[in-house]
C-alpha cells in the first residue's frame, strides 16, 4: 500500500512505526500500541488510533436538536480492545474488571457492569452530528459557500464522499455538520463516518493525525474559519440502553 515509499512514513497516521519490510521490500506501517498493520492510503480506524494514543507518551433554530438517544463521549480516553480489522469490540473492560458496551465509534452505550455483562453485537453509529462554534468574524459566512467548503474538506482531507455529508446547518456562530452512513450504504473502500469525524475532531483541536501534512486551514472565500468549540453527538442504529438513574 501507499506508505510514502521514499522515506517510509504513513501519510494518514503519524502514530505508526514504519519499515521497508513489506512484500518486495515495500514500506509497511504498524500502529503504535497494537502493532496492527495499517493501510496508509486511507484513514486508520478510531479504535487503533485510540489504542496508539494511550500507548504514546502523555503530553501536558435551523439547527438540529439531537434527539434523546444521542450520545456524547463524556467518558474521555480509554485503552480500547480492537478486533483484527481494527474495529471496536462490542464489550470494553478496564483493568478493574468494570465492563460496558460501546457503539462502532467506541462511545459507551450502556451502564457499566462487571465481567458478566454481555454485549451481543457492535451497534453501528449511523448518524453523527458535529456541532461547532466559530470565532467571531466580520460577518456571517455565506451558507452555501460554507456547505461546499466543508463537503470538499471531508472529501479531500478525510476521503469521505460528499454523499455521506447529509447536511450542513449554519446559524452564526454555530455550524452543524451531519454525517449519515447506514450499513447498507457503506461500500468496500468507503471511509467510516466515525473515523472521519475523529480525524476532523483532532484536526480542529490542533492535534492532526496526518504525517507531514499541514494543519487544518479552513477558509470560506478566503476568510479563515477558526473553530473555538466542538461537540459531537452520536446516534446509533439501535438506541442505547441506560438505566433511568443515569437520566436523573
Amino acid at each position: 500500500h501507499t506508505a510514502a515509499q521514499d522515506n517510509c512514513t504513513c501519510p494518514t497516521n503519524k502514530m505508526t512505526v514504519c519499515s521497508p519490510d513489506g512484500p518486495g521490500g515495500r514500506c509497511q506501517c504498524r500502529a503504535l500500541g497494537s502493532g496492527v498493520a495499517v493501510d496508509c492510503s486511507t484513514l486508520t480506524s478510531k479504535c487503533l488510533l485510540l489504542k496508539a494514543r494511550m500507548s504514546a507518551p502523555k503530553n501536558a433554530r435551523t439547527l438540529v436538536r439531537p434527539n434523546e438517544h444521542a450520545l456524547v463521549d463524556n467518558d474521555g480516553l480509554y485503552d480500547p480492545d480492537c478486533d483484527p480489522e481494527g474495529r471496536f469490540k462490542a464489550r470494553q473492560c478496564n483493568q478493574t474488571s468494570v465492563c460496558w458496551c460501546v457503539n462502532s465509534v467506541g462511545v459507551r452505550r450502556t451502564d457499566k457492569g462487571d465481567l458478566s455483562l454481555r454485549c451481543d453485537e457492535l451497534v453501528r453509529t449511523h448518524h453523527i452530528l458535529i456541532d461547532l462554534r466559530h470565532r467571531p468574524t466580520a460577518g456571517a459566512f455565506n451558507h452555501s459557500d460554507l456547505d461546499a467548503e466543508l463537503r470538499r474538506l471531508f472529501r479531500e482531507r478525510y476521503r469521505l464522499h460528499p454523499k455521506f455529508v447529509a447536511a450542513v446547518h449554519y446559524e452564526q456562530p454555530t455550524i452543524q455538520i451531519e454525517l449519515r452512513q447506514n450499513t447498507s450504504q457503506k461500500a468496500a473502500g468507503d471511509v467510516d463516518i466515525g473515523d472521519a469525524a475523529y480525524y476532523f475532531e483532532r484536526d480542529v483541536k490542533g492535534e492532526s493525525l496526518f504525517q507531514g501534512r499541514g494543519g487544518l486551514d479552513l477558509r470560506v472565500r478566503g476568510e479563515p474559519l477558526q473553530v473555538e468549540r466542538t461537540l459531537i453527538y452520536y446516534l446509533d442504529e439501535i438506541p442505547p440502553k441506560f438505566s433511568m438513574k443515569r437520566l436523573t
Epitope: 501507499t2 494518514t12 492510503s41 470538499r152 479531500e156 464522499h161 454523499k163 473502500g189 468507503d190 496526518f210
Partner: antibody
C-alpha cells in the same frame, strides 16, 4: 487559461510499460484533485484513476488496479500515470482531467489527449 | 458498479429545434450526475454537474434535470456548434462510470 498537456503515449507491446505525463498550467494545481480518463477506439469513455490534491489518496477501477499508478508532483505542476502489464484492451486515447473544485468527481477541464496503442 | 444507460444512441435534429437526451442509472445516485459534450476530433467538455448545475461558460440553452435514477439533458434552440456526442457520468462514488454516449447529428 487552464491548460493540460499530455505526453508519453505511443505504441507498446502487450506486457510492456509506459509512463504518461500531464503538464498543468493556468490554475493552482496543488488545490485540485486530478484524474485520468481514456476513450476507447469505439468512443467509450472509461475512468482510469484519480488522485487528491496533495497526493495522499488514490482511486482506481478494478480493471487497472495493481497495474496502473497515478501520482503527482505539485512542485512541478505535473500529473503522471505509470502503466505496466499493458493489455490490448488498454489501447485508447488517454486524457488528463481536472476535477471540479466543488463538483467532486465531475471533470471540468480535459487535455487534448495522448494516444496509447498496445499491440504486438 | 453503477451502470449508466443513455438513450437514444443517436438522433438527428435541425438548428432551432429542442432535443432531450436521457440517462438512467442502475441504482440511486441522487443528484451526482454530470453531462459532457464532445465535438468531432476534440476533447470532452463539462456541461453540467450535480444533475442541474451548469458549468462555467455553458450557454443557458442547456439544462440538466432529474435525480435518483432518471436524468435528462435538454438543449433548447439547437445551434450549429451543438452537434457532436454527449455523455453522462455518475459521480456518486468509486468506480466512476460513463454512459455509452448519444450522437447528435444535423438532419
Amino acid at each position: 487559461e487552464v491548460k493540460l498537456d499530455e505526453s508519453g503515449g505511443g505504441l507498446v507491446k502487450p506486457g510492456g510499460s509506459l509512463k504518461l505525463s500531464c503538464a498543468a498550467s493556468g490554475f493552482t494545481f496543488s488545490s485540485y484533485t486530478m484524474s485520468w480518463v481514456r476513450q476507447t477506439p469505439e468512443k467509450r469513455l472509461e475512468w482510469v484513476a484519480t488522485i487528491n490534491s496533495d497526493g495522499i489518496y488514490t482511486y482506481y477501477p478494478d480493471s487497472v488496479k495493481g497495474r496502473f499508478t497515478i501520482s503527482r508532483d505539485n512542485a512541478k505542476n505535473t500529473l503522471y500515470l505509470q502503466m505496466s502489464s499493458l493489455k490490448s484492451e488498454d489501447t485508447a486515447m488517454y486524457y488528463c482531467t481536472r476535477v471540479h473544485y466543488y463538483g467532486y468527481d465531475a471533470m471540468d477541464y480535459w487535455g487534448q489527449g495522448t494516444s496509447v496503442t498496445v499491440s504486438s | 458498479e453503477i451502470q449508466m444507460t443513455q438513450s437514444p444512441a443517436s438522433l438527428s435534429a435541425s438548428v432551432g429545434e429542442t432535443v432531450t437526451i436521457t440517462c438512467r442509472a442502475s441504482e440511486n445516485i441522487y443528484s451526482y450526475l454530470a453531462w459532457y459534450q464532445q465535438k468531432q476530433g476534440k476533447s470532452p467538455q463539462l456541461l453540467v454537474y450535480s444533475a442541474k448545475t451548469l458549468a462555467e461558460g455553458v450557454p443557458s440553452r442547456f439544462s440538466g434535470s432529474g435525480s435518483g435514477t432518471h436524468f435528462s439533458l435538454k438543449i433548447n434552440s439547437l445551434q450549429p456548434e451543438d452537434f457532436g456526442s454527449y455523455y453522462c457520468q455518475h459521480h456518486y462514488g468509486i468506480p466512476l462510470t460513463f454512459g455509452a454516449g448519444t450522437k447528435l447529428e444535423l438532419k
